[in-house]
Amino acid sequence: KLTIESTPFNVAEGKEVLLLVHNLPQHLFGYSWYKGERVDGNRQIIGYVIGTQQATPGPAYSGREIIYPNASLLIQNIIQNDTGFYTLHVIKSDLVNEEATGQFRVYPELPKPSISSNNSKPVEDKDAVAFTCEPETQDATYLWWVNNQSLPVSPRLQLSNGNRTLTLFNVTRNDTASYKCETQNPVSARRSDSVILNVLYGPDAPTISPLNTSYRSGENLNLSCHAASNPPAQYSWFVNGTFQQSTQELFIPNITVNNSGSYTCQAHNSDTGLNRTTVTTITVYAEPPKPFITSNNSNPVEDEDAVALTCEPEIQNTTYLWWVNNQSLPVSPRLQLSNDNRTLTLLSVTRNDVGPYECGIQNELSVDHSDPVILNVLYGPDDPTISPSYTYYRPGVNLSLSCHAASNPPAQYSWLIDGNIQQHTQELFISNITEKNSGLYTCQANNSASGHSRTTVKTITVSAELPKPSISSNNSKPVEDKDAVAFTCEPEAQNTTYLWWVNGQSLPVSPRLQLSNGNRTLTLFNVTRNDARAYVCGIQNSVSANRSDPVTLDVLYGPDTPIISPPDSSYLSGANLNLSCHSASNPSPQYSWRINGIPQQHTQVLFIAKITPNNNGTYACFVSNLATGRNNSIVKSITVSA
């Protein structure tokens, strides 16, 4: 089939395009090209007769077209008007016509864009800025870059006007960045120069340094003020409300008690017109004052926050002392004292760090104590506990579940059933339950102060019939004469009888066997190797009874005192000595031999061929059980006679 391929399909203005013909029939008389989707004499571009190799321009010929013998058409110096469809009309020798249509699109080469802004000096948290990418170009795509990255997702960033305009609402100082726009069309892409947004902000609340507020008479007072601001702030100082000077630093030498008072730093931004002040109270002491403790965090979060307790006032050449719970400081990697001992930092506080804390200032005559300070440590919630612990309930009873999680402040609770929220209470009560109340019951504990949440999920089954039980154990490999083992029959269910069997028999009477927890738990105290039996638990209620699969207790024991065989101790010279050692043990022990105290081999059997009187001596077998950590040995004297 006759087809036309445009190379390229998207053509830049001023460039050229080739309309390439595929599957041209044989035995042709000639062909003509037309502008448009159909053959129209008024829109003929050029005709070509193969026999004469003669090309004839038509009404739509612009002088920029070249036709090739293979019927392909080259159009040069493309203009916007050239966009559209082109139809090739082929006349075969048998005068049967065939047509094919192709098309291309013309796009301009884009100029380098530039950014215009409606506000060159926007004010933080007040102004919006609209950047517009110039010029406006048809069929162009507009893109934006911030610090050479694509636009971040933000409710304060809005694109409009076909992405040509980028608006930043409520600008912040963090919007101070390099902005670029890019225009793209199918034939070109251009990026603008960067525009730096200059956001006016501040002044923030000034910071007065040093933080030290207590001074002794005779010292120099040197206060510095700083406030984040663009443009930089202008500073003024006031003492007890009276203007002092317009500088960033305030210096008063050789202060006295009269210099005590409120020191105010005022920061002013002439562009935003805003003022902010910070006041610090300076106390000049003639004598060391009664100390007091300040904290940088009155409600620290457990395992998250550090707390710095500072003993005030700061007095040069003074010894600071600390007490916790009326004791001197314990040694702990979480407790750190500053070089001057004035600040006690608790790293990663825990709920046990509440205190009380006291600090003291030591002078020539005595130690002045501060009042005690107690920390309010926010913690939790821990994993909630749902009680009671039953997992099986029979239909018709009331279901009453209570949830508790250690938390400060106390947790807020929510209950979910199969993921659906039920109520925001600590207790969940459902009367007259049915099988439909079976499901996953989730208690969610939330600490509003720390923002932490923890959940516990409990599967509740409502069924008159009990499941097949199983046995859980708190110790899968107990050691003889040392460990106790508690077997528990699962699940825990209301109105249920629990039964136990050992090796298919009901429980023997023994002071080492104890039933507890409504017969649900069977405890074996001081296990022995004879307790290595098959244990089965059973549950029964009004409509069902079931036994668990047996659980066999694997008791680790030994090694017992070994036995060396044969028992003979006298041998004739030339005989073979073949000693075997055995010790009752679980797991099997490791064996080793020593002859006259000298280590030999790590085997159960010791073999020496053709012994002589030189082989007289003590033969010791050593046994070791790695699981119980116990060892044993036996010594045998061997006499070889000539």
Partner: antibody
Framework: QVQLQQSGAELVKSGGSVKLSCTAS????????MHWVRQGPEQGLEWIGW????????EYAPKFQGKATFTTDTSSNTAYLQLSSLTSEDTAVYYC?????????????WGQGTTVTVSS | ENVLTQSPAIVSASPGEKVTITCSAS?????MHWFQQKPGTSPKLVIY???NLASGVPARFSGSGSGTSYSLTISRMEAEDAATYYC?????????FGAGTKLELK
């Protein structure tokens, strides 16, 4: 060996009542639950309910609430089923049965059944 | 209440033939139990908790299923197996039985 011996057949007038007994041997009824099941002529099995002889707790099928009453006498190791306001629909064989506590089987021990015929 | 539907109602089988009886519950149950009853006798438990063989029951009996669909299978029919078989659920009150399937010897 466990056995449940039920009382003999009963012929009762419509509107009357009857008390059936089931005496256990080979085990203590306080250690288990006693269930009652009935079977109408040429019909299937119908569960009536159970009693816990240890504390007198009962559970009845809704259909038999007010119709059947369970009691026990632990001194004679006997369970009783009283039926009231009898109609011809109550003509059936009534079975007692229990699940042994020493194993996983329930409805394993059955009485031989008591035939109750209600005449008009 | 949970209605149990047994099928077929009546089935005939030759000695040695495999027989399967099904029981469908109107609501999901945790297990199914099967009883055998011969004329003039009390019911006898054959399968408990879906698939466990009751004491003294031949190994040719087996049970399976879950949710709402359960079955009892006799791998090779014998003359003594001719009886009516009932399924029973104990998950919810009231406890209910199926209407029964009568197994006849062909």
């Amino acid at each position: 060996q466990v056995q449940l011996q039920q009382s003999g057949a009963e012929l009762v007038k419509s509107g009357g009542s009857v008390k059936l007994s089931c005496t256990a041997s080979g085990f203590n009824i306080k250690d288990s639950y006693m269930h009652w099941v009935r079977q109408g002529p040429e019909q299937g099995l119908e569960w009536i309910g159970w009693i816990d002889p240890e504390n007198g707790d009962t559970e009845y099928a809704p259909k038999f609430q007010g119709k059947a009453t369970f009691t026990t006498d632990t001194s004679s190791n006997t369970a009783y089923l009283q039926l009231s306001s009898l109609t011809s629909e109550d003509t059936a064989v009534y079975y007692c049965n229990e699940g042994t506590p020493d194993g996983p089987y329930y409805f394993d021990y059955w009485g031989q059944g008591t035939t109750v015929t209600v005449s008009s | 209440e949970n209605v149990l539907t047994q099928s077929p109602a009546i089935v005939s089988a030759s000695p040695g033939e495999k027989v399967t009886i099904t029981c469908s519950a109107s609501s999901s149950v945790s297990a199914m139990h099967w009883f055998q009853q011969k004329p003039g006798t009390s019911p006898k438990l054959v399968i408990y908790s879906t698939s466990n063989l009751a004491s003294g029951v031949p190994a040719r009996f087996s049970g399976s299923g879950s949710g709402t669909s359960y079955s009892l299978t006799i791998s090779r029919m014998e003359a003594e197996d001719a009886a009516t078989y009932y399924c029973q659920q104990r998950s919810s009150y009231p406890l209910t039985f199926g209407a029964g399937t009568k197994l006849e010897l062909k």
